[in-house]
Interface confidence: low
């Protein structure tokens, strides 16, 4: 039985040209995290594998930085970066946990961070 929960930064907003940190945290499970995938819709952004470290997809290499921790930093944001982002935790023996973050990139200087929420 999967008992863990994923806590994410929830719905967030940031300014065009700026940076944002996408963060997820897996709790309430003793399962071993073998790999975390960061995906945007159907595109793979980055992978952090417990044994092999970080891999950033070539098409995102210039604008995506690993960390902090298992999080991901998006840089030089554009309006096209608006959308859903998913952290996918591959664990042993539980299986897969998925967290969702919605990022809105704003033209203006008004960018408020949303509240945290949990996905069981």
């Amino acid at each position: 039985m999967m008992t863990g929960t994923i806590e994410t930064t929830g719905n967030i907003s940031a300014e065009k040209g700026g940076s944002i940190i996408l963060q997820c945290h897996l709790s309430s499970t003793t399962a071993q995290v073998t790999q975390v995938n960061w995906e945007q819709q159907d595109q793979l952004l980055a992978i952090c594998n417990a044994d092999l470290g970080w891999h950033i997809s070539p098409s995102f290499k210039d604008r995506v930085a690993p960390g902090p921790g298992l999080g991901l930093t998006l840089q030089s944001l554009t309006v096209n970066d608006t959308g859903e982002y998913f952290c996918i935790y591959h664990t042993y023996p539980d299986g897969t946990y998925t967290g969702r973050i919605f990022l809105e990139v704003l033209e203006s200087s008004v960018a408020e961070h949303g509240a945290r929420f949990q996905i069981p």
Partner: antibody
């Protein structure tokens, strides 16, 4: 194009050591892991372990722990596998393979293989 | 370690036949299953990754399906160059990668 070129065939006596090299080209060496797989004559594939070219982390198959060491030289984009205390049942073709991230760590490129014969 | 059992161990088929090879895992591995083709004296070649994704450059007659513990490799219409040995491999447990024992596909 991606290429993995391995060192030549070796003949060793029982109790000796062998070191096989695998020179990578055509991609960013430190962005991927190198796995080693062996195949005894007429037998199936056996995973030996892997090394992260990113951070040097290693992960060895349980049955080989204590006898195998995997290393990389990032300056020459070369991976090495050393097997010690050789026995006759270590006679096999040894392959290096790149662990493809987008392929969920499937081995997307392979070296040509190195035949290691252990015989007194 | 997670064990993979392929069936059949060998089979004979003719050019043009539809062929199915199965791979069963000893526990759920999600979709972390890959398929390889190996010809005598050559290194294995990745055909299918993530259970059903076709590796670049591989003909579309090859397809994969399954999730959890049961997986299938299908060749829709056998070509002469397809006679080889096929292996499944799991990468779910990254601490202990394992391969199936192989399926030898021979000409009838």
């Amino acid at each position: 194009q991606v290429q993995l070129v391995q060192s030549g065939a070796e003949v060793k006596k029982p109790g000796a050591s062998v070191k096989v090299s695998c020179k990578a080209s055509g991609y960013t060496f430190t962005s991927y892991g190198i796995s080693w797989v062996r195949q005894a004559p007429g037998q199936g594939l056996e995973w030996m372990g892997w090394i992260s070219a990113y951070n040097g982390n290693t992960n060895y198959a349980q049955k080989l722990q204590g006898r195998v060491t995997m290393t990389t030289d990032t300056s020459t984009s070369t991976a090495y596998m050393e097997l010690r205390s050789l026995r006759s049942d270590d006679t096999a073709v040894y392959y290096c393979a790149r662990a493809g991230w987008e392929q969920q760590l499937g081995f997307d490129y392979w070296g040509q293989g190195t035949l290691v014969t252990v015989s007194s | 370690a997670i064990q993979l059992t392929q069936s059949p161990s060998s089979l004979s088929a003719s050019v043009g036949d539809r062929v199915t090879i199965t791979c069963r895992a000893s526990q759920s591995i999600s979709s972390y299953l890959n398929w390889y083709q190996q010809k005598p004296g050559k290194a294995p070649k990745l055909l299918i990754y993530a259970a059903s994704s076709l590796q670049s450059g591989v003909p579309s007659r090859f397809s994969g399906s399954g999730s959890g513990t049961d997986f299938t490799l299908t060749i829709s219409s056998l070509q002469p160059e397809d006679f080889a040995t096929y292996y499944c491999q799991q990468s779910y447990s990254t601490l202990a990668i394992t391969f199936g024992q192989g399926t030898r596909l021979e000409i009838k």
